[in-house]
């Protein structure tokens, strides 16, 4: 059965999925899709990485963590009730029929009438939208949003802070993690 994750309407949802690269920079193709994992890849793909970069994404879906270190957890921005359902994280380990696949259930709850104070910082404030583009040279990373001067070190630090928070650890403990090599 699927592991269940919850978010409120208007919030960002976090669906954890991790792997440990065999060597730094030795990335594995990963896809995220809406719907249970089919036989191959992901159904209704919302985001995909290859051996180098994020090579496909759709609006509102992105990777906040350091996918180059195997954190391929999905963030869905500003969720609505329609975002409820099963999501597939598939880690396409090279070789013959080596895939690891994880079905995660996202439950969206109606927003509370009076918002309660949150114990951790807002995902959007902590992480401006990352846009990774493919090119002929090295991967080019741009940040979109209110923090134009943020750099990769800061992003990595923020990612570590998030992962060190109790909520993120809880999610990680019950999420999808595999080790390669």
């Amino acid at each position: 059965s699927e592991v269940e994750y919850r978010a409120e309407v208007g919030q960002n949802a976090y669906l954890p999925c991790f792997y440990t690269p065999a060597a730094p920079g030795n990335l594995v193709p990963v896809c995220w899709g809406k719907g249970a994992c089919p036989v191959f890849e992901c159904g209704n793909v919302v985001l995909r990485t290859d051996e180098r970069d994020v090579n496909y994404w759709t609006s509102r879906y992105w990777l906040n963590g350091d996918f180059r270190k195997g954190d391929v957890s999905l963030t869905i921005e500003n969720v609505t009730l329609a975002d409820s359902g099963i999501y597939c994280c598939r880690i396409q380990i090279p070789g013959i029929m080596n895939d690891e696949k994880f079905n995660l259930k996202l439950v969206i709850k109606p927003a509370k009438v009076t918002p309660a104070p949150t114990r951790q910082r807002d995902f959007t404030a902590a992480f401006p939208r990352m846009l990774t583009t493919r090119g002929h040279g090295p991967a080019e990373t741009q940040t979109l949003g209110s923090l134009p001067d943020i750099n990769l070190t800061q992003i990595s630090t923020l990612a570590n802070e998030l992962r060190d928070s109790r909520l993120a650890n809880d999610l990680r403990d019950s999420g999808a993690t595999i080790r390669i090599g």
């Epitope: 193709p29 719907g35 249970a36 089919p38 036989v39 191959f40 890849e41 159904g43 290859d50 051996e51 099963i86 396409q92 380990i93 090279p94 070789g95 013959i96 029929m97 080596n98 895939d99």
Partner: antibody, heavy 116, light 108 residues
């Protein structure tokens, strides 16, 4: 226009080998998963093998695992199926097909006959 | 593996009639991951439907798919002469990919 053209079929003795090729055109070959599906004479369709975009991940039906090897050369827009230790029951028309889970374009097929 | 059983084996109908083809799975097909293909003699299969009900590019709207779980249906609302062929269902919810044995739609 998407085109898939298989070649390499023929008559081979049991235990022999064949290498099938599928030349693709009309689409960005490296951007799609590819498959081999076969059809024995007068019978239904049987999925044989699949390969991911870059070729790093491969998948096989139990009936051919360990005997067949799928590969691709994205620089040549070509899909391959190396078939070893062939058996009479491998006799079929072999189709290459484009797609991930459903197959939206198919070649016309190449006939492989395994007989002594 | 999921076994797909198609019925009837042969359907004898006249042009203009409605054809209803059934595909039953031995276990539930997740997320309605089911496709339908048409194959004419000497030709390659042609994708008609994916996701149980989505028509593939260029497929006339007289073809429609429905169903979920273990029971799926392909309906041809009004048979045209070019529709007489063999039809296969295929599931992609559980490894390996499997096809049904086919239903032949022949002219009555």
């Amino acid at each position: 226009e998407v085109q898939l053209l298989e070649s390499g079929g023929g008559l081979v003795q049991p235990g022999g080998s064949l290498r099938l090729s599928c030349a693709a055109s009309g689409f960005t070959f490296s951007g799609y998963w590819m498959h081999w599906v076969r059809q024995a004479p007068g019978k239904g369709l049987e999925w044989v093998s699949a390969i991911s975009y870059s070729g790093s991940s491969t998948y096989y039906a139990d009936s051919v695992k360990g005997r067949f090897t799928i590969s691709r050369d994205n620089s040549k827009n070509t899909l391959y199926l190396q078939m070893n230790s062939l058996r009479a029951e491998d006799t079929a028309v072999y189709y290459c097909a484009k797609g991930t889970n459903w197959l939206d374009y198919w070649g016309q097929g190449t006939l492989v006959t395994v007989s002594s | 593996e999921i076994v797909l059983t198609q019925s009837p084996g042969t359907l004898s109908l006249s042009p203009g009639e409605r054809a209803t083809l059934s595909c039953r799975a031995s276990q539930s097909v997740s997320s309605s991951y089911l496709a339908w293909y048409q194959q004419k003699p000497g030709q390659a299969p042609r994708l008609l439907i994916y996701g149980a009900s989505s028509r593939a590019t260029g497929i006339p709207d007289r073809f429609s798919g429905s169903g979920s779980g273990t029971d799926f249906t392909l309906t041809i609302s009004r048979l045209e002469p070019e529709d007489f062929a063999v039809y296969y269902c295929q599931q992609y919810g559980s490894s390996p990919l499997t096809f049904g044995q086919g239903t032949k739609v022949e002219i009555k």
